[in-house]
Amino acid sequence: MMTGTIETTGNISAEKGGSIILQCHLSSTTAQVTQVNWEQQDQLLAICNADLGWHISPSFKDRVAPGPGLGLTLQSLTVNDTGEYFCIYHTYPDGTYTGRIFLEVLESSVAEHGARFQIP
């Protein structure tokens, strides 16, 4: 039985040209996290494997950085980066947990988001 829950940064916004950290946290389960996949629609952004470390998809290598922790940092944001992002936690023995984050990239300097998820 899957007892875990994923907490995410929820709906966030950031300025065009800036950076943002996408964070998820799996709690309320003793399941072992074997891998975390970060995705945007049908695109795989990155994989964090518990044994093998990080793989950033080549399409995103120039603007995506691993971490902090199991999170993902998006850099040089454009308005095209607006949309849904998913963290997929592959766990044993529970199976798969999915978290959703909506990112809005704003043209102006009025972007508001939690400071702890922003890269200065």
Partner: antibody, heavy 120, light 107 residues
């Protein structure tokens, strides 16, 4: 250049343990991931498991109860043990390297393969 | 486990003509797909990773495409040296799994 060479008996009796070694040259096994993959005659390639740069192991759940992958860093080699073999374990066994950071789970260097037959 | 299904099983192509191999995943694997070529008597060789990126030294007549569940390996102009078996593989989640292979022959 990375080179991998499998060695071990070509014939194993049913219920015994299959033991293979992969000697690696041109690269240290304390980097990247070191894998075993097999191909039974007329069947798909089957992923057996890996030992990571840090010595952590992953085994395909379908074989997990029978498989052990270990390494000897002083000899720059890693090994496969598969216990309680049956005719279904007859296959070409490949050792291989995987550079997870650059290529994800895509295997970039393979040994030439060694044929193991399980028969009395 | 994710099942990778390749079609066709075999393919006979005239030199200089194109060839196309399909691979279908039993669930969404995004772009975590690789393609390998196995020439007769040799071990598999990585051709494509991340669905569409050519590995070092792979001729540009080879291309990969697709995302989600449907993937394609194309050879724009088949040459005699391209004979062999081609395999797809998913690495979206463990256990990493392979397709059954497509044998490419020359007419």
């Amino acid at each position: 250049e990375v080179q991998l060479q499998e060695s071990g008996p070509g014939l194993v009796k049913p219920s015994e343990t299959l033991s293979l070694t992969c000697a690696v040259s041109g690269y240290s096994i304390t980097s990247d991931s070191w894998n075993w993959i097999r191909q039974p005659p007329g069947k798909k390639l089957e992923y057996i498991g890996y030992i990571s740069y840090s010595g952590n192991t992953y085994y395909n759940p379908s074989l997990k109860s029978r498989v052990t992958i270990s390494r000897d860093t002083s000899k720059n080699q890693f090994s496969l043990k598969l216990s309680s073999v049956t005719a279904a374990d007859t296959a070409v066994y490949y050792c291989a390297r995987l550079d997870f950071s650059n290529y994800g789970g895509a295997v970039d260097y393979w040994g030439q393969g060694t044929t193991v037959t399980v028969s009395s | 486990d994710i099942v990778m299904t390749q079609t066709p099983l075999s393919l006979s192509v005239t030199p200089g003509q194109p060839a196309s191999i399909s691979c279908k995943a039993s669930q969404n694997v995004r772009t975590a797909v690789a393609w390998y070529q196995q020439k007769p008597g040799q071990s598999p060789q990585l051709m494509i990773y991340s669905a569409s990126y050519r590995y070092t030294g792979v001729p540009d007549r080879f291309s990969g495409s697709g995302s989600g569940t449907d993937f394609t390996l194309k050879i724009s102009r088949v040459e005699a040296e391209d004979v062999g078996v081609y395999y797809c593989q998913q690495y979206y989640t463990t256990p990493w799994t392979f397709g059954g292979g497509t044998k490419v022959e020359i007419k």
